[in-house]
């Protein structure tokens, strides 16, 4: 069941999921000057069964100058560097090391993808927060949020995190000492 709204926003923090539950949607968003093609789903879907899950549908972006074409535009090398999520490469290397039943890993980037990934999460999904570069984490509890269903309505729990001051960024689960990791190695990220 889809969560009605997005995870809470924490000032000076980003969140990511370790893995995505079946039913999760990832919108096919494109960077400026490009748009998703008109044929095919407007989103990718984490689908499958308890033993194997994968992303269904493929996102494709086309030049928005050519309004009625579905030609894929191959980006120049410098354009491919535009994604702002700098930790993505290291996360993708870790992704192959773990597979949670009924979950999908972070899908690989597509050509001319937008800098921000827009997910529709499902009930039971946990996302983890960390402070952005230059801000220090003050923890009053878990720096995570879970989408829960109560009385037929979905809600996200409030992460117990405040980002303040100037220092190194805090870590997502799996990026610090092993005992600090709640779910094992991270498989994915999203930036807000």
């Amino acid at each position: 069941e889809l969560c009605d709204d997005d995870p809470p926003k924490i000032t000076h923090a980003t969140f990511k999921a370790v893995a995505y539950k079946e039913g999760t949607m990832l919108n096919c968003e494109c960077k400026r000057g490009f748009r998703r093609i008109k044929s095919g789903s407007p989103y990718m879907l984490c689908t499958g069964n308890s033993s194997h899950s994968s992303w269904d549908n493929q996102c494709q972006c086309t030049s928005s100058a050519a309004r009625n074409t579905t030609k894929q535009v191959t980006p120049q090398p410098e354009e491919q560097k535009e994604r702002k999520t700098t930790e993505m490469q290291s996360q993708m290397q870790l992704a192959d090391q773990v597979s949670l039943p009924g979950h999908c890993r972070e899908p690989p980037p597509w050509e001319n993808e937008a800098t921000e990934r827009i997910y529709h999460f499902v009930v039971g999904q946990t996302v983890y927060y960390q402070c952005v570069q230059g801000y220090r984490a003050l923890h009053r509890g878990p720096a995570e949020s879970v989408c829960k269903m109560t009385h037929g309505k979905t809600r996200w729990t409030q992460p117990q995190l405040i980002c303040t001051g100037e220092t190194e960024p805090s870590q997502f689960p799996g990026e610090e000492e092993p005992q600090a990791s709640p779910d094992g190695l991270p498989e994915s990220e999203t930036s807000r």
Epitope: D5, G23, N27, E29, C30, K38, S41, T47, S64, E116
Partner: antibody
Framework: QVQLQQSGAELVRPGTSVKMSCKAA????????IGWVKQRPGHGLEWIGD????????DYNEKFTGKATLTADTSSSTAYMQLSSLTSEDSAIYYC???????WGQGTLVTVSA | DTTVTQSQKFMSTSVGDRVSVTCKAS??????VAWYQQKPGQSPKALIY???YRYSGVPDRFTGSGSGTDFTLTISNVQSEDLAEYFC?????????FGGGTKLEIK
């Protein structure tokens, strides 16, 4: 809570135009396409088109090209649809829809009558 | 354009019964199909996305299935509050198109 609040009913003359609004709340307006759907008794639901407030992209169902004009104001998180050269065929309920079809507005009833 | 057909305009059922509403697309739409419920005087409510996934708050007696061109919305243990019109929609290719609707009547 995610909500799409549409403007009130309109009674308009043939040949004129009407502009209705759809105010989004509870989510990031610029992240999601907003679509518009027409419903007439006996004619089911028809997709008019959609707009991406963040990217500025607009797609129209060819049937509604020249009839509908979609715009969005990101500062107020409001999408608009203007219908021009109104005829009795345009009398209908118009819905806005967002968040990958999950959320629908309550609808705006447009009645075209002399 | 992809034509979406709901061949049964009306279906009659009793409380506690199981009923299946069908939908056929004129071309392969994968699983890019949604189902909506519309009660009299209300706007459509999203029930199912991607052919088989329920939206939040939708009772589990509503089940979607199918892929390609043939899709089914099954309501098991029908309740009186299920009295409504049900629409399917394809969003595999533009323009998105809807079925003509199936009105569920409770005996």
């Amino acid at each position: 809570q995610v909500q799409l609040q549409q403007s009130g009913a309109e009674l308009v003359r043939p040949g004129t135009s009407v502009k209705m609004s759809c105010k989004a709340a509870g989510y990031t307006f610029t992240n999601y396409w907003i679509g518009w759907v027409k419903q007439r008794p006996g004619h089911g639901l028809e997709w008019i088109g959609d707009i991406h407030p963040g990217g500025g992209y607009i797609d129209y169902n060819e049937k509604f090209t020249g009839k509908a004009t979609l715009t969005a104001d990101t500062s107020s998180s409001t999408a608009y649809m203007q219908l021009s050269s109104l005829t009795s065929e345009d009398s209908a309920i118009y819905y806005c829809v967002s968040r990958n079809f999950a959320k629908w507005g309550q609808g705006t009833l447009v009645t075209v009558s002399a | 354009d992809t034509t979406v057909t709901q061949s049964q305009k009306f279906m009659s059922t009793s409380v506690g019964d199981r009923v299946s509403v069908t939908c056929k697309a004129s071309q392969n739409v994968g699983t890019n199909v949604a189902w909506y419920q519309q009660k009299p005087g209300q706007s459509p409510k999203a029930l199912i996305y991607s052919a088989s996934y329920r939206y939040s708050g939708v009772p589990d007696r509503f089940t979607g299935s199918g892929s390609g061109t043939d899709f089914t919305l099954t309501i098991s243990n029908v309740q009186s509050e299920d009295l409504a019109e049900y629409f399917c929609q394809q969003y595999n290719s533009y323009p998105y198109t809807f079925g003509g609707g199936t009105k569920l009547e409770i005996k």
